[in-house]
Structure formats: structure tokens, C-alpha cells
């Protein structure tokens, strides 16, 4: 995550420092479109992997147990093939003219329809979304190479549904139980979360308006991984680091155009799944088998 | 105090390469992307490209074939190289920060024999 | 590309007056546009970004507003320091792209 040298607090009277609020953002599109795109672009396919991942691919049953309440988790495990005609995402729901994410190459039209990963507009407006300052073009995020093949990676069936179980302190912990097909892994990030020191390299399509100076050979990631293991693993941010990471005062009400600069940076923490902790990594007193969710709010 | 300093030739031969170092203090390059815009007479205010925290680039297309952007964040340094200069390249090259009041002092690099 | 259009390249004004300066966007661009003071010899200077927001240390005689593909940037109580060229830009889409100018003289 780029870490701010300067003093945080800006000096803007929006109380946004717009030049850090467009580099974070793109920071965490690049985080995310490096995991899921290919060549510099999100496709449908992509798009349902980023979902099923921050599990809003499908609806979920959840069972909330009280202390007192010990019920086996055993019985969810189908959840996901009994909902799967709830997928509400089709190919043509998520074009807009926002130039940003694209989920196609739309090279013969000329027109460049991208979809902001946050967006509170209706999908189909012309670049209606005030808050991609970075524009919603510019934001042609950046790791967009072709390192994700949706056919490497793990079918929604194979995830199974989201269980929260309450402990006596009245926090939830989830659990996402997965089960993967023999022989297939979850790899994990690989991507650093600290920027390289020294780079030239543009890992992108002519067609956006970038340049591809090295071929793209790297072994893919598939798109399904625990959490974010790396030697630099992603924190887990609240929302007062939210907001001072992206140039944010923190007293200050957030407009619509301002929470839109959050958007990337909070679905990547998700991705990231960098809130939750395993419990063999960390002593805590919850149930066996569950990650727990660490307070960021 | 955040500073971006230019230092680059004035004068450059028609089809050869201009070659801008932007030298930032005040911030660092793993924080914010830097920006390249152009002003000419003829052409006003044209918006060149940017290089990322990561590293990573975006071009405007019209300059796409010719133009590269890189950096050094132990530096401070970002690295402007342009290729194939024509006399319609004259211009005055600046480096900025985003859309803010921190831009360079410009270079102005006249492309003639 | 998105054009941004400034249809007045000239505007003429008195000191003590009121004058507003426009921008047009080929397409909307929501609010995502800076509004850019330059004087000659000088690198553009960032008076408003997000149509509508000044950055510190800039007069509050200077107001911008607009969203979608209609700006204004107001000028009320002008100075003889405000004698400039005032360039609009948007950083919606790629390229971001700047609008032709409107140089302000002082009568």
C-alpha cells in the first residue's frame, strides 16, 4: 500500500487531496485488475471471479448462532448449486461510458465503455460517475496483463456459503468454507503490495492506449487464494486510514464524489481478505475452523 | 515543501529524441503518479501521460508509438523520452502532479536544424 | 478524446467586476474538472478541482461550478492580479484533455 511522506492533513477546502485520493485509487485498481484482468481489461468472467471472491456472486444463506447455540456448519455446504440461477450479473448489465475498467475490448466501435467498480449511477449513463476523478477513463489500471485465464480457475459451485458465527462478545466471525476440486490450489497473491523501487515497464494493450514493453509469460495466479500472505501482506485498514491514505480529512463529511475515490481501495481489502485472520496464525478465542473479522470500522 | 524540478535540452534535432528528468522532493514517487503535459502555441495545453506508484504507464494515444515514461523512487527521479521529434513538437514539457498546482518550471525545447 | 471548449478566447473586464468564464465538455465528465490560472512565463496554477472546490490559498473571490458538460468559473471583485489566461481540464477520461483558453484583460 504507497504510503504517504507528506503530511497528511490537506490543505484543500474540500478537505480531499485530490493527487493522492487519484494516485490510492489507482494504486488499488492496479491491485485488482492485476489479479482479475486481462489484457487491461475486466471481462464478465473476471468481473464474476472479483464477485464470487468478495462473496457477492450469488445469494447465501448465513446462520448467526448465539454462545449458547452450537449448531453443526456442516449442513450449508450446497448453498451455492441451490442458488445458482440467482447469478445477477449478464453480459450486457455492466457497459457504461465511464472509461475505466474495461470489461471488453471495444476496439472496432472506438469507444472505450468501462464500468467503475463502485458505481452509484445507473450503469448505463455517459461517464456518470463524479467521483472518478481519476477519471473513469483515467483509470486504465495498471498490472491489466493477461494473467488470468478464467478457465485455470475454480467454478463458483466450488465455494460454498458464508457462515457467521456469534461468540459471547457479540462480534461475528466468518467462515468460508472452500472446497476445491482434487488436485486444484489456491495460490496466493503474489503481486507485492510496496510498489518496485525502479520500473518502466507498462504491462498493457496498445488498444487502451498504453504500451506492452515485455511479453506476458509470468505463471498466471488462479483467481481464487486465501488471504494476502505476502512478505508485505496488505493491512487492514479502518476508516480513518482509508480516508488519510487517499488524501482524506477525517472530520469531514463525505460526499459522494469523495467516498467514490474509497471504492477500489475498500474492494480490494476485501479481496485481499486483508481484515481476516486465520486462527492458527493467531491465538483468539473463537471457534475452531473459522477466520475471524477483525474490527475495521 | 513538495518541488518538481525539469532539467532537459532547449534545442533538439528534427527525428531525434528529447530526454526530460523530473526530479521530485516533498513527497515521494511510491504516493503519487506523475503527469506529463505539453504546451504549445499552436496546440494549447495537451496532456502527454502519467507513470503510476507502481511503475505502470498511460499514454496519450496520439503520442503512444514515440513516447516513454519511466522512474527511479530511490531518486526521486521520473524519467520523459520522447522520440521522432518533429518542428510541431516545439513546446514547453512540463511534469506535474496530478491535477494540482505542483508542476515543474517547464522545459521549453525548440526541435530545429 | 473529450474536447473541452472554451468558446470566449478573449474576455475583457474592469477591476471591481464580476466575470465568469465556460467550459464545455464533448460528454459528460460529472465533476471530475480543474480550473487552471496562468500567467505569462508562469507554470499553470491549479485554482479548482472537482468543478467546485478551491485549493488552499486561492482568493474566495474565485468559484466554480458545474457538472456534466457545463463549467463556470466565476470571478467576482476582480483584481489587476487576475490578469491571466484560465484554462479548464478534465480528468474524467483518457487522455485528460484541456480546453483552449480564455485570456483575461484588464480594461
Known amino acids: 500500500f504507497p504510503q504517504t511522506t507528506e503530511k497528511i492533513s490537506p490543505n484543500w477546502e474540500s478537505g480531499i487531496n485530490v493527487d493522492l485520493a487519484i494516485s490510492t485509487r489507482q494504486y488499488h485498481l492496479q491491485q485488482l485488475f492485476y489479479r482479475y484482468g486481462e489484457n487491461n481489461s475486466l471481462s464478465v468472467e473476471g468481473f464474476r471471479k472479483l464477485l464470487q471472491n468478495i462473496g457477492i456472486d450469488k445469494i447465501k444463506r448465513i446462520h448467526i448462532h448465539h454462545d449458547h447455540d452450537h449448531h453443526s456448519d456442516h449442513e450449508h455446504h450446497s448453498d451455492h448449486e441451490r442458488h445458482s440461477d440467482h447469478e445477477h450479473h449478464s453480459e450486457h448489465e455492466h457497459h457504461s461510458d465511464h472509461d475505466h475498467h474495461s470489461h471488453h475490448n471495444h476496439a472496432a466501435s472506438g469507444k472505450n465503455k468501462r464500468k467503475a467498480l463502485c458505481p452509484d449511477h445507473d450503469s448505463d449513463s455517459s461517464g456518470k460517475d463524479p467521483r472518478n476523478s481519476q477519471g473513469k477513463g483515467a483509470h486504465r489500471p495498471e498490472h491489466a496483463s493477461g494473467r488470468r485465464n478464467v478457465k485455470d480457475s475454480v467454478s463458483a459451485s466450488e465455494v460454498t456459503s458464508t457462515v457467521y458465527n456469534t461468540v459471547s462478545e457479540g462480534t461475528h466471525f466468518l467462515e468460508t468454507i472452500e472446497t476445491p476440486r482434487p488436485g486444484k490450489l489456491f495460490p496466493k497473491d503474489v503481486s507485492s503490495s510496496t510498489p518496485p523501487s525502479v520500473t518502466s515497464k507498462s504491462r498493457v494493450s496498445r488498444l487502451a492506449g498504453r504500451k506492452t514493453n515485455e511479453s506476458v509469460s509470468e505463471p498466471r495466479k488462479g483467481f481464487m487464494y486465501s488471504r494476502n500472505t505476502n512478505e508485505n501482506p496488505q493491512e487492514c485498514f479502518n476508516a480513518s486510514k482509508l480516508l488519510t491514505s487517499h488524501g482524506m480529512g477525517i472530520q469531514v463529511p463525505l460526499n459522494a464524489t469523495e467516498f467514490n475515490y474509497l471504492c477500489p481501495a475498500i474492494i480490494n481489502q476485501i479481496d485481499a481478505r486483508s481484515c481476516l485472520i486465520h486462527t492458527s496464525e493467531k491465538k483468539a478465542e473463537i471457534p475452531p475452523k473459522t477466520y475471524s473479522l477483525q474490527i475495521a470500522w | 515543501q513538495v518541488q518538481l524540478k525539469q532539467s532537459g535540452p532547449g534545442l533538439v534535432q528534427p527525428s531525434q529524441s528529447l530526454s526530460i528528468t523530473c526530479t521530485v522532493s516533498g513527497f515521494s514517487l511510491t504516493t503519487y503518479g506523475i503527469h506529463w503535459v505539453r504546451q504549445s502555441p499552436g496546440k494549447g495545453l495537451e496532456w502527454l501521460g502519467v507513470i503510476w506508484t507502481g511503475g505502470t504507464t498511460d499514454y496519450n494515444a496520439a503520442f503512444i508509438s514515440r513516447l516513454s515514461i519511466s522512474k527511479d523512487n530511490s531518486k526521486s527521479q521520473v524519467f520523459f523520452k520522447m522520440n521522432s521529434l518533429q518542428a510541431n513538437d516545439t513546446a514547453i514539457y512540463y511534469c506535474a502532479r496530478g491535477p494540482s498546482s505542483y508542476w515543474g518550471q517547464g522545459t521549453l525545447v525548440t526541435v530545429s536544424a | 478524446d473529450i474536447v473541452m471548449t472554451q468558446s470566449q478566447k478573449f474576455m475583457s473586464t474592469s477591476v471591481g467586476d464580476r466575470v465568469s468564464v465556460t467550459c464545455k465538455a464533448s460528454?459528460?465528465?460529472?465533476?471530475?474538472v480543474v480550473w487552471y490560472q496562468q500567467k505569462p512565463g508562469q507554470s499553470p496554477k491549479a485554482l479548482i478541482h472537482s468543478a467546485s472546490y478551491r485549493y488552499s490559498g486561492v482568493p474566495d473571490r474565485f468559484t466554480g461550478s458545474g457538472s456534466g458538460t457545463d463549467f463556470t468559473l466565476t470571478i467576482s471583485n476582480v483584481q489587476s492580479e487576475d490578469l491571466a489566461e484560465y484554462f479548464c481540464?478534465?480528468?474524467?477520461?483518457?487522455?485528460?484533455?484541456f480546453g483552449g483558453g480564455t485570456k483575461l484583460e484588464i480594461k
Open positions: 460528454q459528460n465528465v460529472d465533476t471530475n
Open positions: 481540464q478534465q480528468y474524467n477520461n483518457y487522455p485528460w484533455t
